[in-house]
């Protein structure tokens, strides 16, 4: 099977991917409204109605020669401008910059609150099975199983940072050397990419929105797939990696410091820390085969204990075991040893919500999954549309051009390399590379930043994590100094080999063309979004994993010809781009091959076949939902539904569906290009419920 | 009150069996040791064996294995032992006794339980 | 096994004297000692634990001392009631044994 089906397709008819409008208004040249409705010689318009509320922003096309769908829009100030305002209206309208401020401010806290929530959910769900994942011996010698491991436990857990301190706690104790802890740490650079993807799934209701979103995302993740599948071969090959960590380690004389500054966190832990506190060590204890920590909660209970040094009687297998026979007894059944032992005292209870619930990991996790992402996805839409009312006119030119436009000549260069360093510098500061890119995807999504500017921002969020591990490994106990700066300089080399490997040279941007390509495949078809996260932060790791476990000759077995076809695929694929004339005529497309097989249309047709009967009742719910927010705010016209709701009804009412008329707050026609492809469910459902 | 309470003297032919019960009162029964130490007439005090009711682990001195035998019913809070091919030497006062946690040392103790070996 | 040796068998005071009777391990047990006290037709009663320390009730004119192989039951003052057989018993190794008794009598 082709690999990226329609890629191919991807530039040369841009119209297939454009919608009516980017969000409520028609795709049209530089010209106002009233041009368009008296001079019909332009490109012809459909009318459409502006909600008042939902957004003062006009989004235009600029006039290309051909309308590109990855050209940002232009956001256009439809509002009243500020010499022709009032005394009472700037007053009005300073008050409302500074509200959209406090409110953008406040849902930003929220959005950043619930990813760490977000990451303690996963922990609880999956984090005991994810240490689990360590304890196996086969890392050591498999650096394709470290890879997936690492993969895999930063997916579940949806924290680098727990994985790399796993990997360092378990080379400190020396369960792990280095070498193998250098490919867990490349595969746990791919699992964080997996939280701005998800991120990006939340905005999948606008078409052209999401396919910058969802671009801007997984150019994280081609950028970090890349450079694994390059340099993981050469790190088992040369173990460039491990030696030029050791150089450093060895030539500095290091004394273990003060804490890695706390910065955004210093913010965020007193709200999050009320919400659910998670014992860390207890994933770090399976992983080193603790067999007690397997039966450990990690909600974390008590929060103020005391620890005291004292000797206790404790049994021991036999004589063997006693350091001299005077310091054994027995009691007549077991022998006895006097061993010192910390005794923890419990003095007071932590202040979460989930304290005296008693509740297990699993329930815990799951709750604090739905309302985190119920809190993320809820936040996202609030920034986006805050966004979307605040960059208009003057304001996103100036944001626009600042962020987007090179240096002038000869120094053009020389912008990207300063974006790497913002990216690193912002990640810095958050002490968080899924925070930073997940708040960099919206932006992405609205058009704000180019995704050719968000790869180097996203790039510089690599090496800014990598830093934050440096510091923190500098304030490592002793016992750990070594093993800890080691592994957090393998991490920041490996980032640097791949920007070295995909950004200096333009020609070598893959990632980028990549992420292109995967856009214009999801905003064509949405539910490959969600297949792709699947497939590639779980399907192939779990894959791999298992054909690991069976050992070599299997995974071989299997494994080669797969990268046969795979390559073979994008020989094929190389050549039929660029020389054709070369292939048999039979070669120069894929038709040759079933339609299933270099085409997403028959896999949409059955997806719409099985999640058809759920669109409707879901976008009846969202309708309700809008209603009651109107009704609870007293604004008939504040809320309107996601666009594919609107999609599915345009489909229906083309196949003489009766679709609910619309009410006060539905203010809104659209247009039959702004359809897209969504077909719409074969069950006639009418959201009567309204 | 920790009490133990040893049933009634026995008087049994060689090579019989006799099975002697202590019963424990007052204390968390599964939390102790009970050892069975055995005090021949005019002779002094021989541990026989232990056993732990909360986990059923036994252990004996080897003269006795193999003719001891030590059993606990948790629900009724007794130990019993049981001896085997009994021989004139087997005459003896049977004590049982509980050990302090983390020690052989005994605190409390039963009775006694008097057998007498004869044909 | 460990052999527990104790000395004198039999040993005749008055009341008001002072009586020590040692016991000697056949090997180091390290202070896990056990002194008892056995009356005609009463159970037998624990005096001292580890060696010298007195259990919870014992007059305290009753002290143990002692290390490594050597120890000794001391006491300071001897009082009627005090006229029984002495044991000792160590808990260092399985199986645990018994001193063979020393009975003391009123002179």
């Known amino acids: 099977m082709a690999p990226w089906p329609e890629l191919g397709d991807a530039q040369p008819n841009p119209s297939k991917y454009l919608e009516g409008a980017t969000s409520q208004q028609p795709i049209t040249p530089d010209k106002s409204k009233e041009t368009n409705k008296t001079d019909n010689t332009e490109v012809p318009v459909t009318k459409f109605e502006l909600l008042p509320t939902y957004s003062t922003a006009t989004l235009i096309e600029e006039p290309t020669e051909v309308d590109d769908p990855w050209n940002l829009p232009t956001l256009q100030d439809s509002g009243i401008k500020w010499s022709e305002r009032d005394a009472k209206g700037k007053i009005l309208c300073v008050f409302q910059g500074i509200g959209r401020l406090i409110l953008l401010l406040g849902f930003l806290y929220f959005f950043v609150c619930s990813l760490d929530v977000l990451s303690s959910a996963f922990q609880l769900v999956g984090g005991k099975m994810a240490g689990q994942f360590f304890s196996n011996s086969s890392i050591m010698s498999n650096p394709l199983l470290g890879l997936v491991i690492g993969v895999l436990v930063t997916v579940f857990v949806q924290s680098s940072s727990t994985s790399t301190s796993i990997v360092v706690s378990m080379v400190a104790s020396s369960l792990l050397t280095v070498r193998a802890a250098i490919p867990i740490i490349m595969g746990a650079n791919i699992g964080t990419s997996i939280t701005n993807t998800i991120v990006a799934l939340m905005q999948v209701g606008d078409r052209s929105e999401f396919r910058r979103a969802f671009a801007g995302a997984t150019v994280h993740d081609f950028f970090n797939w890349l450079s694994v599948l390059v340099l993981l071969p050469v790190e088992v090959a040369t173990h460039y990696l491990e030696v030029v960590t050791q150089l450093i380690v060895e030539s500095f004389h290091f004394k273990n410091g003060e804490d890695a500054p706390d910065l955004l966190k210093v913010i965020t832990k007193p709200f999050t820390k009320l919400i659910v506190q998670l014992d860390k060590k207890v994933i770090s204890q399976i992983a080193m085969n603790d067999e007690t920590a397997k039966n450990k909660s990690l909600v974390k209970i008590w929060c103020k204990t005391f620890t005291n040094m004292t000797q206790m009687n404790v049994t021991v297998p036999s004589m063997a075991n006693c350091t001299s026979h005077s310091l054994c007894w027995t009691d007549g059944i077991q022998i006895w040893t006097m061993k010192n032992v910390t005794y923890k005292e419990n003095i007071a209870k932590c202040q979460h919500i989930f304290v005296n619930f008693h509740l297990p990991d699993l329930a815990v996790g799951i709750i604090l999954l739905i309302i985190s992402l119920l809190v993320l996805c809820g936040c996202l839409i609030m920034i986006v549309k805050i966004l979307g009312s605040v960059l208009k006119g003057q304001v996103a030119t100036v944001i626009k051009k600042t962020i987007n436009t090179d240096f002038p000549f000869p120094f053009a260069w020389l912008t990207g390399y300063l974006a790497i360093l913002v990216g690193a510098g912002m990640t810095f500061i958050v002490q968080s590379s899924s925070v930073f890119t997940s708040a960099l995807t919206p932006l992405i999504g609205i058009g704000v930043i180019t995704i050719e500017r968000a790869y180097p921002l996203t790039l510089g969020s690599n090496i800014g994590t990598t830093t934050t591990a440096i510091l923190a490994a500098l304030a490592s106990p002793g016992n750990t100094l070594r093993s800890s700066l080691q592994i957090a300089l393998c991490h920041f080399f490996f980032n640097i080999s791949g920007i070295l490997l995909w950004y200096p040279i333009p020609f070598t941007r893959l990632p980028i063309r990549m992420a292109k390509g995967l856009g214009n495949i999801s905003a064509k078809y949405r539910w490959f979004a969600v297949f792709y996260l699947i497939i590639f932060f779980f399907l192939i790791p779990l894959t791999v994993f298992g054909l690991s476990l069976a050992g070599w000759p299997v995974l071989v077995g299997v494994g080669v010809p797969v990268v046969f076809i795979i390559i073979l695929v994008l020989c094929l694929r190389l050549l039929q781009s660029r020389c054709p004339r070369v292939l048999p005529k039979k070669l120069q497309n894929w038709n040759f091959l079933p339609l299933c097989m270099h085409s997403l249309k028959p896999w949409d047709a059955v997806i719409s076949k099985f999640t058809g009967p759920f669109q409707m009742p879901c976008c009846c719910c969202c309708r309700v939902c809008c209603r009651v927010c109107c009704l609870l705010c007293g604004c008939p016209k504040c809320c309107r539904c996601s666009k594919c709701c609107q999609d599915l009804e345009e489909g229906q009412e083309a196949q003489g569906v009766p679709v609910k008329a619309p009410e006060t707050f539905d203010n809104i026609t659209i247009s039959r290009e702004a359809q897209g492809e969504v077909r719409a469910p074969d069950s006639k459902t009418e959201c009567t419920a309204l | 009150e920790v009490q133990l309470v040893q049933s009634g003297a026995e008087v049994v032919k060689p090579g019989a069996s006799v099975k002697m019960s202590c019963k424990a009162s007052?204390?968390?029964?599964?939390?102790?040791?009970i050892h069975w130490v055995k005090q021949a007439p005019g002779q002094g005090l021989e541990w026989i064996g232990a056993i732990y009711p909360g986990s059923g682990a036994t252990s004996y001195k080897q003269k006795f294995r193999g003719r001891a035998t030590l059993t606990a019913d948790t629900s009724t809070s007794t130990v019993y032992m049981e001896l085997s091919s009994l021989r004139s030497e087997d005459s003896a006062v049977y004590y049982c006794?509980?050990?302090?946690?983390?020690?052989?040392?005994?605190?409390?103790w039963g009775q006694g339980t008097l057998v007498t070996v004869s044909s | 096994d460990i052999q527990m040796t104790q000395s004198p068998s039999s040993l005749s005071a008055s009341v008001g004297d002072r009586v020590t009777i040692t016991c000697s391990a056949s090997?180091?047990?390290?202070?896990?000692l056990n002194w008892y006290q056995q009356k005609p037709g009463k159970t037998v009663k624990v005096l001292i634990y580890?060696?010298?320390s007195l259990y919870s009730g014992v007059p305290s004119r009753f002290s143990g001392s002692g290390s490594g192989t050597d120890y000794t039951l001391t006491i300071s003052s001897l009082q009627p009631e005090d006229f029984a057989t002495y044991y000792c018993q160590q808990y260092s190794k399985l199986p645990l044994t018994f001193g063979q008794g020393t009975k003391l009598e009123l002179k």
């Open positions: 090997q180091d047990i390290g202070n896990f």
């Open positions: 007052g204390y968390t029964f599964t939390g102790y040791i």
């Open positions: 006794a509980r050990g302090e946690t983390a020690r052989a040392t005994f605190a409390y």
């Open positions: 580890y060696a010298s």
